[in-house]
Amino acid sequence: IWELKKDVYVVELDWYPDAPGEMVVLTCDTPEEDGITWTLDQSGEVLGSGKTLTIQVKEFGDAGQYTCHKGGEALSHSLLLLHKKEDGIWSTDVLKDQKEPKNKTFLRCEAKNYSGRFTCWWLTTISTDLTFSVKSSRGSSNPQGVTCGAVTLSAERVRGDNKEYEYSVECQEDSACPAAEERLPIEVMVDAIHKLKYENYTSSFFIRDIIKPDPPKNLQLKPLKNSRQAEVSWEYPDTWSTPHSYFSLTFCIQVQGKSKREKKDRIFTDKTSATVICRKNASFSVQAQDRYYSSSWSEWASVPCS
Amino acid sequence: RNLSVATPGPEMFPCLHHSQNLLKAASNTLQKARQILEFYPCTSEEIDHEDITKDKTSTVEACLPLELIKNESCLNSRETSVITKGSCLASRKTSFMMALCLRSIYEDLQIYQVEFKTMNAKLLMDPKRQIFLDQNILGVIDELMQALNFNSETVPQKSSLEEPDFYKTKIRLCILLHAFRIRAVTIDRVMSYLNAS
């Protein structure tokens, strides 16, 4: 058993049928010695008396808010949450496995640039009695500060019969140098509490590996006189790290015909302009990636050819 | 074809091309090593990210773009030393910092060259003959060093009398290749920045 925060305790249980559970001793936070009784949650049933209460915690019915009373007045509370260990592996009931970029990915994180700011998100089908808290640091043995904001419900989607909820959090490394070579990964730890179940999820990454630039901006297409060709140009997104000659991007450009089946001609360039053959009803698209480190491509920015 | 992109003229800055080759070679060698050593802890998540140039060179700080010099988080340490001009500085007014930066890059390459050669010597003794560094990566390091053209004392190649532990050597190779790829990214960024300025 360990203390999560004041008056909230997590009992770690080896979770299998007929498991003996864990013996927990609760102590009433009071100078009083006599006439103390204990109850669980809203039930008025007295579980025991005395300054301490010893309980065997086996399943969720044994978890909850234990209160010690004297003469009808509550003296102190202890909330017991359960953390299930199933055959050596902590349970992951609350969050959905996003399976990207690999199985057992519960937290996904992205950064738009090298400023040390990043966003993480996660999915659940649970809609009520759910709380999250997030901590982050660079490195774990001698951690350097990362400050995270409040967790927000960022999206709701219908997936088949189920509703899926996306939560996200923004974090900022306290002293980040965009040009630094990362040696220690960023650690993100999310505590999830659903009713009386406690779970924790972690992700470890380097900012360089989670970079995903915003799409190129100001995408413009100028037809060339007396030609089927057009001059296209675009700019680095505003959110990308500067100077651009140091934090350079490379671009993938394509012309997509009206039919999705039509062969797409893709080429790569480090420049911010190109000459394309742009037929009517087609569209021109461009996406960006760090020029020197193969992290994610941005989403496409598109403009119609007509 | 529906697309065409004009190709740039020759780089004004002769080191840019070499640094691009360096990054390609570093990335390809790391990728190949990860495939060959698939049963060894060789992924980014599994290895310790060590910087073998730590306390010997100060490339990141010395090569900071001017725009980032105001960022206090970027200025942990600054090293100054006697600088000699290399041919990469050809016919351009260069600040003391730029010379220091290129000197630091040269010294990085020298350190890695020695480490890779020592490692290769060990790996060639492995009866499994599972992996060794091809001449490409050593050749590319050498080309960039020649382009930088600094005169410096040769770093002696480390020799080891004890029987090499090939498992540890291969893990060490992974650590070095990951670190070298990261440094190659920095070098390429720096050369691109200098070429643009």
Epitope: Y16, P17, E59, D87, G88 | -
Partner: antibody
């Protein structure tokens, strides 16, 4: 004490279907994940499928994916395995078992797929 | 086929010590705990060892388990006639959990 009893096995022709049941007693069935494991005659143990305590997530071995469906009825304390498009290589003793460090196995039910 | 490799058979005289190895990789045994089962002919597997080296109550202390790196082993000391059975190791893969990974199985024969 924990008890698991499989039923529903038998002889079936290739391409046909069969539904296995596993009746659980002696524990809070709705709190625990459950597995199906099979063993072909003279061969080793092979994991088939897993279902979460609340039925929210199901996992399958590649060899049965798309043909077998694991399900549970927590009100009846019963685990099921619906087996469609049966093949000769599905011939085995099928066991249900609890998920956890200390597990409990049923006695098994024999499924023979033969023409 | 199984990704956890065991020797097909081991044998020993009564009273002897035999060991069964179970070889995996970084993503399974290297990252997860190991169980060992005993299966007597015509019966369901019986748990002998969990969490690499822990014995459930009722399992004789002649059975012991250990794990090192990407492999595990089961030792039976003071071999007895009733130990003649098939033995399986079991673990998980960090990317496919909760799928159970079973070893190929080892037939233990008690000589004489």
């Amino acid at each position: 004490q924990v008890q698991l009893v499989e039923s529903g096995g038998g002889v079936v022709q290739p391409g046909r279907s069969l539904r296995l049941s596993c009746a659980a007693s002696g524990f809070t069935f709705s709190s625990y994940g459950m597995h199906w494991v099979r063993q072909a005659p003279g061969k080793g143990l092979e994991w088939v499928a897993f279902i979460r305590y609340d039925g929210s997530n199901k996992y399958y071995a590649d060899s049965v994916k798309g043909r077998f469906t694991i399900s549970r009825d927590n009100s009846k304390n019963t685990l099921y395995l619906q087996m469609n498009s049966l093949r000769a290589e599905d011939t085995a003793v099928y066991y249900c078992k609890t998920h956890g460090s200390h597990d409990n196995w049923g006695q098994g039910t024999m499924v023979t797929v033969s023409s | 086929q199984s990704v956890l490799t065991q020797p097909p058979s081991v044998s020993g005289a009564p009273g002897q010590r035999v060991t069964i190895s179970c070889s995996g990789s970084r993503s399974n045994i290297g990252s997860n705990t190991v169980k060992w089962y005993q299966q007597l002919p015509g019966t369901a597997p019986k748990l002998l060892i969990y969490y690499n080296d822990q014995r459930p109550s009722g399992v004789p202390d002649r059975f012991s388990g250990s794990k090192s790196g990407t492999s595990a082993s089961l030792a039976i000391t003071g071999l007895q006639a009733e130990d003649e059975a098939d033995y399986y190791c079991q673990s998980y893969d960090r990317y496919t959990h909760p799928a159970l990974l079973f070893g190929t199985g080892t037939k233990v024969t008690v000589l004489g």
